[in-house]
Interface confidence: low
Amino acid sequence: ARSEDRYRNPKGSACSRIWQSPRFIARKRGFTVKMHCYMNSASGNVSWLWKQEMDENPQQLKLEKGRMEESQNESLATLTIQGIRFEDNGIYFCQQKCNNTSEVYQGCGTELRVMGFSTLAQLKQRNTLKD
């Protein structure tokens, strides 16, 4: 099966597919990071969820004014986090709720690892991990 089949709603909804990238980001503290969600339709607003640990359920991300910003156009939603901190570590998910069906679709997640000043090289290899 093609990889995009995983995102396709069998009912054929107008916003049944959503792709999130990158899957992993490792950056030093203080840097700015961006993560993106690509949609096949603008039929529905995108929100962002976050979880800090693998066995937690994602929860609504509270955007810190002046440091975290979300934007959305026809087919692209972007979350920008400036001056990343250790407490920003976690997995971020975009989520789209369709206007016409109220169905909800979620990206596969972007893991953010905020590094100190010595271990960034150790994790660079993770950028090449497959889904």
């Epitope: 800090q52 066995d55 937690e56 509270k62 004014k65």
Partner: antibody
Framework: EVQLLESGGGLVQPGGSLRLSCAAS????????MTWVRQAPGKGLEWVSG????????YYADSVKGRFTISRDNSKNTLFLQMNSLSAEDTAVYYC??????????????WGQGTMVTVSS | SSELTQPPSVSVSPGQTARITCSGD??????AYWYQQKSGQAPVLVIY???KRPSGIPERFSGSNSGTMATLTISGAQVEDEAAYYC???????????FGGGTKLTVL
């Protein structure tokens, strides 16, 4: 009906130990983080300790770190708080509380009625 | 760890609007939660994630969080709302949870 029933409180001498238990029922215990909160007589609420759904991650207030140990038995739907080296400052009603979700850092939506711990000689 | 600061007491007449504030450095990036505790009883969650109301909580209870200040508003306070109210959040390290000192609401 969601219920949390604490037990194990009582009178203990300074330096002594107690083990509190909290029996959970009416919800799927294994998918919620859990917390202990205490309230000294006539005082406000004080967060004591929290534990993740799996029990792997535990969190403690500075005032109890190294003396208290939180744990859970998911097979028995029970939360525990082992309290050692108790002092008069630990005298309080101890509440067991269920997290809003699986999130370690969530607030609690359901509380037990509490069990009284008195530390006195 | 961070602290949450509340006024010790607030008094209103029945039918008036009561506002209880909670200030903390971490509140711009952390959710605020509010508990009501009546004398001799366990706390009850009345507001979660800044402004959401659990089922069973009257509509007169509302919450907001702007900057470093969270506010619990009781529109048309009633005698049965007389209680201690506590705000709650995580501190900036996210490893500790913090309660405010509590505010005694008197409706007279």
């Amino acid at each position: 009906e969601v219920q949390l029933l604490e037990s194990g409180g009582g009178l203990v001498q300074p330096g002594g130990s107690l083990r509190l238990s909290c029996a959970a029922s009416g919800f799927t215990f294994t998918i919620y983080a859990m917390t202990w909160v205490r309230q000294a007589p006539g005082k406000g609420l004080e967060w004591v300790s929290g534990i993740s759904v799996s029990g792997i991650r535990t969190y403690y207030a500075d005032s109890v770190k190294g003396r208290f140990t939180i744990s859970r038995d998911n097979s028995k739907n029970t939360l525990f708080l082992q309290m050692n080296s108790l002092s008069a400052e630990d005298t309080a009603v101890y509440y067991c509380a269920k997290g809003l979700s699986s999130g370690d850092r969530d607030a609690s939506d359901i509380w037990g009625q509490g069990t009284m711990v008195t530390v006195s000689s | 760890s961070s602290e949450l600061t509340q006024p010790p007491s607030v008094s209103v007449s029945p039918g008036q609007t009561a506002r209880i504030t909670c200030s903390g450095d971490a509140l711009p990036r952390k959710y605020a939660y509010w508990y009501q505790q009546k004398s001799g009883q366990a706390p009850v969650l009345v507001i979660y994630e800044d402004s959401k109301r659990p089922s069973g909580i009257p509509e007169r209870f509302s919450g907001s969080n702007s900057g470093t200040m969270a506010t619990l508003t009781i529109s048309g306070a009633q005698v049965e709302d007389e209680a201690a109210y506590y705000c709650y959040s995580t501190d900036s390290s996210a490893n500790h949870r913090v309660f405010g000192g509590g505010t005694k609401l008197t409706v007279l």
